[in-house]
């Protein structure tokens, strides 16, 4: 059947053959209605990435810097299944490219001009591409050739396989530049050893190269890894102090029609019947004809690649800049030491106004993304389409997972001018209710709920987490018989209450009129019977503070909060009747932009923050008349964190343990696959 | 609400220039921040230039140099004067201004650009 076959493309004799015995083996284990091989032989692996663009083949196993080629367009191509290395318990999909020192040294990564370089080899990517990728746009002009570059910026270098003769400084700590182990200094190990022999400064290679070297942990203490933040790290924090994380070897298809379900249908089965030590007749992970034929000879089995997860994530922001650098061997004009315009990721089209108001105001230091979802934001800001946006504490931490850091937390009660230099506790989830209503905490199975979003703090995380461990199971959408949870699937009964209009009911951003804190209490207002909101608001929506027309004749006396003792009690005090304690929203970025944010946000909040007082004729930062555009309304500022500069820091323990809780009933594809 | 309409559009060859404007119902002094945006065919809406009270503009990098926005607060009145004009300008122009702070995406009519040979 041709849409169950796979048609693998093979590039030489030796893989085409294994390519058919691959075949003819699935063949022998596979029902007839189940997925089958195919194999087209070309000349290349990019012929092959071609051949799959154009639908002439359907899959093909790539090392890192062809799964780039793939991604590009007219290619188009994505991930879609991982070989993995070491144990089923502990499977290593990627390695991490380190920068490695001498702890007794006292340079950091933008210090090493005029330091000697110990490289794996020309052209490799822990030693070379990754490394001088990253430089490149520190090193002197003209940067071509790049190897009379690199030579100019370090003052000697061991260079593996570099041309000794066009470029001796390259050779300068290992005369003719070996390109084998007869080389002392060839490859991780020998790059490490210019190192450790003091032949050089610094080591690029890959994390697990200095533990391969040094059984000893007092050996290896000696040591330490440039962070490309200019800091330091111990050898063991490898993933938090790299140059770039690099997938081993990937399964590539199309993006469109690319059949990933059936292709990892197939190598599911392949690794089960022809694995590691599974089979004596044909073996997935070897090869009589030769080595590393259709995958890695030294790879234990298969990984899914989450569908959320595009080459560009998958690839990872750092490979791909420096990928890009030594491809396209473009640099910004302006001094990498000057902070560029901050591009703010705005959701759908009432934030991408806003925030173009922002743009002109700002002259342009503030420049406008969009995206539809919170989620395709932070993608954005993972993968430098954007820099920051500020973000409730339950994307915080999906955020911080996908490794981005806060920056600033808004601040919601602390006057100016204290404000920018105070850490608040937090803001309260509550539960509320209409004061006609009998409900309590205890009796809201089967009643209509509505919520601010899904992976939200107040509105899903806290009280869905409380939920969980009184349930001890994640089908909250029996448990309500009906409500609005923007973010839910849209045919889940947590979508049925939503108001829409129609192509954008449920979705999670603002064209969904129940969406945020005012969407949800409007929902409570005409349809729902408990919405999960922060305290301030039904005080911010009623008594003719929201002047739209369902808010304008609310009454506050007409709602109440729900207590977890089963009590209720006024909106007035939520520090005695709420679900828990709330961080606050905080900005976040990647850690390459957290400065040059932090510095333009603490000057434009001083030119359009809560000091402004008149808004219909200024632009105001944190005004849009109850639609939490960009940031909430009732921001007072925005403020530093000092030392509360990572999500768990900023989350605090207790959130951080709870949303983990919650994580088994998760429906976030993007933390799943920035997990992955 | 500000009632803002849009004219000036027109077909020009490339190279050429045109002059929009945009004439408000009610006073426009007290509007903090007007903008150009422009909608070319299956495209986004996009920012072309922005005018705030005190005057200082900011533009879309593609037209830098070759458009440039004011306004006249007695007449008003918002222009966008655009110079140079390239095929990629085709589009529908329209003018906005933000002053409702609600961030609804209401738009007039707009004015027609066709820049073509």
């Known amino acids: 059947v041709p849409e169950k076959s796979v048609r693998w493309c093979a590039v030489s004799e030796h893989e085409a053959t294994k390519c058919q015995s691959f075949r003819d083996h699935m063949k022998s284990v596979l029902p007839s209605n189940g997925p089958s091989v195919a194999c087209v032989k070309k000349a290349s692996h990019l012929d092959c990435i071609r051949a799959i663009a154009a639908n002439e083949a359907d899959a093909v196993t790539l090392d890192a810097g062809l799964v780039y080629d793939a991604y590009l367009a007219p290619n188009n191509l994505k991930p879609v299944v991982a070989e993995f290395y070491g144990s089923k318990e502990d499977p290593q999909t990627f390695y991490y490219a380190v920068a490695v020192v001498k702890k007794d040294s006292d340079f950091q990564m933008n210090q090493l001009r005029g330091r000697k370089s110990c490289h794996t080899g020309l052209g490799r990517s822990a030693g070379w591409n990754i490394p001088i990728g990253l430089l490149y746009c520190d090193l002197p002009e003209p940067r071509k050739p790049l190897e009379k570059a690199v030579a100019n910026f370090f003052s000697g270098s061991c260079v593996p396989c570099a041309d000794g003769t066009d470029f001796p400084q390259l050779c300068q700590l290992c005369p003719g530049c070996g390109c084998s182990t007869l080389n002392q200094y060839f490859s991780y190990s020998g790059a490490f050893k210019c190192l450790k022999d003091g032949a050089g400064d610094v080591a690029f290679v890959k994390h697990s190269t200095i533990f391969e070297n040094l059984a000893n942990k007092a050996d290896r203490d000696q040591y330490e890894l440039l962070c490309l933040d200019n800091t330091r790290k111990s050898v063991d924090e490898y993933k938090d102090c790299h140059l770039a994380r690099v997938p081993s070897h990937t399964v590539v298809a199309r993006s469109v029609g690319g059949k990933e379900d059936l292709i990892w249908e197939l190598l599911n089965q392949a690794q089960e019947h022809f694995g590691k030590d599974k089979s004596k007749e044909f073996q997935l992970f070897s090869s009589p004809h030769g080595k590393d034929l259709l995958f890695k000879d030294s790879a234990h089995g298969f990984l899914k690649v989450p569908p959320r997860m595009d080459a560009k994530m998958y690839l990872g922001y750092e490979y791909i800049t420096a990928i890009r650098n030594l491809r396209e061997g473009t640099c910004p004009e302006a001094p990498t030491d000057e902070c560029k315009p901050v591009k703010w990721c705005a959701l759908s089209h009432h934030e991408r106004l806003k925030c173009d108001e922002w743009s002109v105001n700002s002259a342009g230091k503030i420049e406008c993304e969009s995206a539809e979802t919170t989620e395709d934001c932070i993608a954005k800001i993972m993968n430098g389409e954007a820099d920051a946006m500020s973000l409730d504490g339950g994307f915080v931490y999906i955020a911080g997972m996908c490794g981005l850091v806060p920056v600033l937390a808004e601040n919601y009660n602390t006057p100016n001018p204290n404000c920018e230099n105070t850490a608040e506790e937090g803001y309260f989830a509550v539960a509320v209710v209409k004061s006609s209503s009998d409900l309590t905490w205890d009796n809201l199975k089967g009643k209509k709920s509505c919520h601010t979003a899904v992976g939200r703090t107040a509105g899903w995380n806290i009280p869905m987490g409380l939920l969980y461990s009184k349930i001890n199971h994640c089908r909250f959408d029996e448990f309500f018989s009906e409500g609005c949870a923007p973010g839910s699937e849209k045919n889940s009964s947590l979508c049925k209450l939503c108001m829409g209009p129609s192509p954008n009911l449920c979705e999670p951003n603002n064209k969904e009129g129940y969406y945020g804190y005012t969407g949800a209490f409007r929902c409570l207002v005409e349809k729902g019977d408990v919405a999960f909101v922060k305290h301030q608001t039904v005080p911010q929506n009623t008594g003719g503070k929201n002047p739209d027309a369902w808010a304008k004749n609310l009454k506050e006396e007409d709602y109440e909060l729900l207590c977890l003792d089963g009590s209720r009690k006024s909106v007035q005090e939520p520090a005695n009747c709420h679900l828990a304690r709330a961080p606050n929203h905080a900005v976040v970025a990647r850690k390459d932009k957290a400065d040059c944010v932090q510095t333009l946000l603490l000057d434009q909040q001083r030119m359009f923050g809560s000091s402004v007082t008149d808004c219909s004729s200024n632009f105001c930062l944190f005004e849009s008349k109850t639609k939490d555009l960009l940031f909430r309304d009732d921001t007072v500022c925005l403020a530093k964190l000092h030392d509360r500069n990572t999500y768990e820091k900023y989350l605090g323990e207790e959130y951080v343990k709870a949303v983990t809780n919650l994580r088994k009933c998760s429906t976030s594809p993007l933390l799943e696959a920035c997990t992955f | 609400q500000v009632k803002l309409e849009e004219s000036g559009g027109g077909l020009v060859q490339p190279g050429g220039s045109l002059r929009l404007s945009c004439a408000a119902s009610?006073?426009?002094?007290?509007?903090?921040?007007m903008a150009w945006y422009r909608q070319a065919p299956g495209k986004q809406r996009e920012l072309v230039a922005g005018?705030?009270?005190?005057?200082?503009?900011n533009y879309r990098d593609s037209v830098k140099g070759r458009f440039t926005i004011s306004r006249d607060n007695a007449k008003n009145t918002m222009y966008l004067q655009m110079n140079s004009l390239k095929p990629e300008d085709t589009a529908v122009y329209y003018c906005?201004?933000?002053?409702?702070?609600?961030?609804?995406?209401?738009w007039g009519q707009g004015t027609q650009v066709t820049v073509s040979s």
């Open positions: 005018i705030t009270r005190s005057g200082s503009t």
């Open positions: 906005t201004d933000y002053s409702s702070r609600y961030y609804h995406d209401y």
């Open positions: 009610g006073s426009i002094f007290s509007i903090a921040t």
